[in-house]
């Protein structure tokens, strides 16, 4: 764990990016599944 003020904001940014990446993967998977089912 870091109490660095630069690292603190960067860690939050990294988490946001990871969530976005995960959501994009999940939503992308769902979309492909829908297309496949049609």
């Amino acid at each position: 764990h870091s109490d660095g003020i630069f690292t603190d904001s960067y860690s939050r940014y990294r988490k946001q990016m990871a969530v976005k990446k995960y959501l994009a993967a999940v939503l992308g998977k769902r979309y492909k599944q829908r297309v496949k089912n049609k």
Partner: antibody, heavy 114, light 110 residues
Framework: SVEESGGRLVTPGTPLTLTCTVS????????MIWVRQAPGKGLEWIGI?????DTYYASWAKGRFTISKTSTTVYLKIASPTTEDTATYFC????????????WGQGTLVTVSS | DVVMTQTPASVSEPVGGTVTIKCQAS??????LLWYQQKPGQPPKLLIY???TLASGVSSRFKGSGSGTEFTLTISDLECADAATYYC????????????FGGGTEVVVK
């Protein structure tokens, strides 16, 4: 503590790597920055290396400088120095919100001249 | 990159006086601003972080204020030891904005 070394007189175009040796804290917990100061001029931010090794640079520094690190050392490589790169180069640890301070080295002087 | 513009470049005030230094960011950086003091031949010393929070061991005569794009460093009850150059530095979203310094303000104490 933070201590820079490797500054010397080099001819234009000769690659140079500066070293920043740290002790008393972990590079896996803090970001480190490189800053330079030309003689009689202001401070100029070069770039940062985060705890996880990610690096970011000032727009003007991209392609000219490379920051890297090991467990106790941070490096700044100047790819092809020009006379405009003559300056004192400082390495510093980011400020802490609980420690409420940062750590700077005394700097190392790089002179680029033919 | 965010550009930091500092004014004035130099200021001269008597002992006991007050100095005000301004720093303007080219875009909104919220409260992500540092103030440093640098004396000749020395590395910078952190005075203030998060625009207004005093760093450890720094005199309460130093006061930082502002947010967004306009920031101020005020030094009151000037002492001879305050003669130095002062710099602001942005640290908002360094990964996209960089962490530029202002051009510096030389404070001369008469």
């Amino acid at each position: 503590s933070v201590e820079e070394s490797g500054g010397r007189l080099v001819t234009p175009g000769t690659p140079l790597t500066l070293t920043c040796t740290v002790s008393g804290f972990s590079l896996s917990s803090y970001a480190m920055i490189w800053v330079r100061q030309a003689p009689g001029k202001g401070l100029e931010w070069i770039g940062i290396i985060y705890d996880n090794g990610d690096t970011y640079y000032a727009s003007w520094a991209k392609g000219r400088f490379t920051i890297s690190k090991t467990s106790t050392t941070v490096y700044l490589k100047i790819a092809s120095p020009t006379t405009e790169d003559t300056a004192t180069y400082f390495c510093a640890r980011e400020p802490g919100s609980t420690t409420q301070n940062d750590l700077w080295g005394q700097g190392t002087l790089v002179t680029v001249s033919s | 990159d965010v550009v930091m513009t500092q004014t004035p470049a130099s200021v001269s005030e008597p002992v006991g006086g007050t100095v005000t230094i301004k720093c303007q960011a080219s875009e909104n950086i919220y409260n992500s601003l540092l103030w440093y003091q640098q004396k000749p031949g020395q590395p910078p010393k952190l005075l203030i972080y998060r625009a207004s929070t005093l760093a450890s061991g720094v005199s309460s005569r130093f006061k930082g204020s502002g947010s967004g794009t306009e920031f101020t460093l005020t030094i009151s009850d000037l002492e001879c030891a305050d003669a130095a150059t002062y710099y602001c530095q942005n640290y908002y979203n360094i990964w996209t904005n960089g962490a530029a310094f202002g051009g510096g303000t030389e404070v001369v104490v008469k």
